[in-house]
């Protein structure tokens, strides 16, 4: 018996009631006062939560009964108050006292997994022992009563790839898994209480384990040989065809890049279609059927992202052979040169050959050519591309001719090409020098001997590679004219000087001086030029500037050759 220290008169046992008892009333124990002599003079009362509904007391004896099935998991402790009253006086015999009824546990709850659903992701080919996920079961029973809430885990489904630690619920890999064979595993874990002993209750959960991809597969071409054709007229960047490699991996691990091997000519390239992972073979340089009618190239494929530890799976990259056939196109003629510069001396007779232009058919059949010439009626062209003159050419009329020669294929007049032909007419020395201007020359009646009468210069319509050089001389034929003399300045000018003092306007109003001018051409040409010198009354000023206004008869100079 237990006697309450504060309430000296109360006596009771520790009260326990097992949960889940099915009887209508279950005796728990007895409350009594040590003043109670058993003559039914005391009345016992029960107060507090559960009093009268869950628990009742025998008012005479103090015996307490549970009248309802109890569930420890719902409520494990009841705190009640007890009173004992003297029936005769109606007074409390003892002070009111608090006491406790404990509900004792039975193993009536199975372990439950509260965090469902369980889902885990783990890389494929992970080594044994790799942590996957931890599952936890909860048991509502009393952990302090026996092994009611002591849980052990075991694998119901998932061998041989997974294992579970019995006491922690940690799931680990027990065998490497290949995502390419199976990418999802369904593991069933059982949790048992009572440490799995007889009478244990159990619960299960399903764990969905997904394998994430690792880059353990290299891409491999599904075709070992591709044949493509391309027209020789295809522009740079043309797509020639598609090649395809396949990789069992997924996502980033299946991303691949293609490259061209064995293509010294660097004519082709491969770009990737990111949507389909196909390689598109494109033209990087123009092709020419006549130069090379087919190309054999090798393409290689590899993954874009390879971890160092997986590199061994990617050695010996897959290759495929690509044969590109170039299709012949009827191409226009091709001139030997982009343009021609021809030369011909002026003055050559009609029919003189200027030069030859040549165009060829780049195609295999080598069609003969027809030529047409435009740009000047001074030239013609024959069927083998020889350009001839149709007139005598004069460089002084035109020094350059800009011609266009058109070549067409005899077999296909639609195929046309043109080239510019520049004809330079080069100079022959066919022009003698002459006075550079018309000279109105006057000499004053009162001129002194040695006085400058005129400075003359010459021009030559010929082209000179070196500078023109002119030589001036008084014609020896001009014997009767000693009144003037000529001095060559040797700078392409000459000076006419008076050779006497005084002239008579009335007696000799005009003098004609015959002057020879020679050039430095090969052969040298000489012209005879007449300088008309008029005598003028200049007055004392000896200034000839007024002479031109005196209505003198001007006699033009003339030239003979």
């Amino acid at each position: 018996d237990y006697k309450d220290d504060d309430d000296k008169g109360w006596v009771w046992n520790q009260f326990f009631v097992p949960e889940e008892m099915n009887t209508t009333s279950h005796h728990i124990g007895q409350l009594r006062s040590d003043l109670d002599n058993g003559n039914n003079s005391f009345q016992y009362k029960l107060l507090g939560a559960g009093a009268g509904s869950t628990f009742i007391i025998d008012e005479r004896t103090g015996d307490i009964y549970a009248i309802q099935k109890l569930d420890r998991e719902e409520r494990s402790l009841y705190i009640l108050r007890a009173q004992v009253i003297d029936i005769a006086t109606g007074r409390a015999v003892e002070p009111e006292s608090e006491f406790v009824i404990k509900v004792s546990d039975i193993n009536d709850n199975e372990p439950r997994f509260l965090d469902e659903p369980y889902e885990a992701i783990v890389p494929e080919m992970s080594p044994e022992g790799t942590f996957v996920i931890k599952v936890t079961a909860n048991d509502a029973d009393d952990p302090s009563t026996g092994y009611h809430a002591r849980i052990l885990y075991n694998l119901e489904r998932g061998q041989p790839y997974f294992s579970v630690e019995p006491t922690t619920g940690v799931i680990r890999i027990s065998s490497k898994m290949d995502r390419e064979l199976q990418d999802t595993y369904c593991v069933i874990i059982q949790a048992k209480d009572m440490l799995g002993q007889p009478g244990a209750l159990s619960g299960t959960t399903t764990v969905s384990i997904k394998l994430s991809d690792i880059n353990d597969n290299k891409p491999i071409f599904k075709e070992s040989f591709y044949r493509f054709t391309i027209s020789e007229s295809a522009p740079i960047g043309t797509s020639i065809g598609k090649i395809m490699a396949y990789d069992d991996d997924i996502g980033e691990n299946a991303e691949m890049e293609y490259s061209i091997e064995d293509d010294d000519s660097k004519i082709f390239d491969i770009i990737i279609d990111n949507d389909t992972q196909e390689g598109i073979v494109i033209l990087k340089k123009k092709v020419d059927f006549e130069q090379q009618s087919y190309y054999g190239i090798r393409a290689k494929v590899k993954n874009c992202h390879v971890d160092e530890e997986l590199a061994p799976a990617h050695v010996n990259a897959s290759t495929t052979y690509i044969k590109v056939q170039v299709e012949d196109e009827d191409e226009p003629p091709v001139f030997l040169l982009p343009y021609y510069i021809l030369e011909i001396p002026e003055g050559k007779p009609y029919g003189t050959i200027v030069g030859t232009v040549s165009a060829t058919d780049p195609d295999r059949r080598q069609s003969p050519m027809r030529y047409y010439l435009t740009g000047s009626k001074m030239f013609d062209i024959n069927d083998n591309g020889t350009i001839i003159t149709t007139n005598m050419l004069d460089r002084e009329v035109s020094a350059w001719y800009n011609l266009t020669v058109t070549a067409t294929e005899t077999y296909n007049v639609q195929q046309i090409s043109s080239a510019h032909v520049y004809v330079q007419v080069f100079n022959i020395n066919d022009n003698a020098p002459e006075f550079s201007q018309f000279y109105e020359t006057y000499v004053c009646e009162n001129a002194e001997s040695g006085e400058i009468v005129q400075i003359i210069s010459a021009i030559d319509r010929d082209e000179s590679i070196e500078d023109h050089h002119f030589y001036f001389n008084h014609s020896l034929e001009d014997t009767n004219n000693s009144s003037f003399m000529l001095t060559d300045n040797q700078d392409n000018t000459a000076v006419i000087l008076s050779n006497r003092t005084g002239f008579n306007l009335k007696e000799e109003p005009v003098f004609y001086m015959i002057i020879l001018i020679a050039d430095n051409g090969i052969p040298s040409l000489t012209s005879t030029n007449t300088l008309t010198i008029q005598v003028c009354d200049c007055g004392d000023s000896r200034n000839t500037e007024t002479c031109a206004n005196k209505g003198l008869l001007f006699i033009m100079g003339f030239r003979t050759e």
Partner: antibody, heavy 120, light 111 residues
């Protein structure tokens, strides 16, 4: 040189199980898939499934799902194929064959075959 | 019923050229390599052509493979008596996630 050597012929009763072994040599055992193919008398070839010896992952043809189990023992470089609930139509020659490094690459080496006879 | 269709038999005379066809679908031949196996009676099959048109070393160049769309064919030129055998085509099937075979073609060399 690469060799796949299979276990000897078996005679089984309907409902029983048979376990055929295939011992590999001459190459790295864990680097290539192993496939199982069977051939009933006078019939064509029929693919049963595949195992990845590195880890033991498997994939089975729908027809054999639930009846076939493929396992491997890396210590002896041996692959096993067990077929349960045998019926008379399972009488066939069972071949193991080495696949490529990817599922869809050809079988380059074959075992000599194991004749399994199912008869009551 | 095989997933790949082959003629059950083919015949030819020595020196002749014979072709064996193999028809499939987009999920097998259409998207994957075709392989050809030769099987002599009582022996295991041997690979004859792999990845559509490749010959393993030791296989004479009289044997050639080709593929177009969802069909493939095996051609044997300069037929010889030792070519008499069963020939099987095979391909991985992406939708079945497994290998499929043709029913096999028995080649008879006459004379």
């Amino acid at each position: 040189q690469v060799q796949l050597v299979q276990s000897g012929a078996e005679v089984k009763k309907p409902g029983a199980s048979v376990k055929v072994s295939c011992k590999a040599s001459g190459y790295t055992f864990t680097s290539y898939y192993i496939h199982w193919v069977r051939q009933a008398p006078g019939q064509g070839l029929e693919w049963m499934g595949i195992i990845n010896p590195s880890g033991g992952s498997t994939r089975y043809a729908q027809k054999f799902q639930g009846r076939v189990t493929m396992t491997r023992d890396t210590s002896t470089s041996t692959v096993f194929m067990e077929l349960s609930s045998l019926r008379s139509e399972d009488t066939a020659v069972y071949y193991c064959a080495r696949g490529g490094i990817q599922l869809w690459l050809h079988f380059d080496y074959w075992g000599q075959g194991t004749l399994v006879t199912v008869s009551s | 019923q095989s997933a790949l269709t082959q003629p059950p038999s083919a015949t030819g005379t020595p020196g002749q050229r014979v072709t064996i066809s193999c028809s499939g679908s987009s999920s097998n031949i259409g998207r994957n390599f075709v392989n050809w196996y030769k099987q002599l009676p009582g022996t295991a099959p041997k690979v004859l052509i792999y990845t559509n048109n490749q010959r393993p070393s030791g296989v004479p160049d009289r044997f050639s493979g080709s593929k177009s769309g969802t069909s493939a064919s095996l051609a044997i030129s300069g037929l010889q008596s030792e070519d008499e055998s069963d020939y099987y085509c095979a391909a991985w099937d992406d939708s079945l996630n497994g290998w499929v075979f043709g029913g096999g073609t028995k080649l008879t060399v006459l004379g």
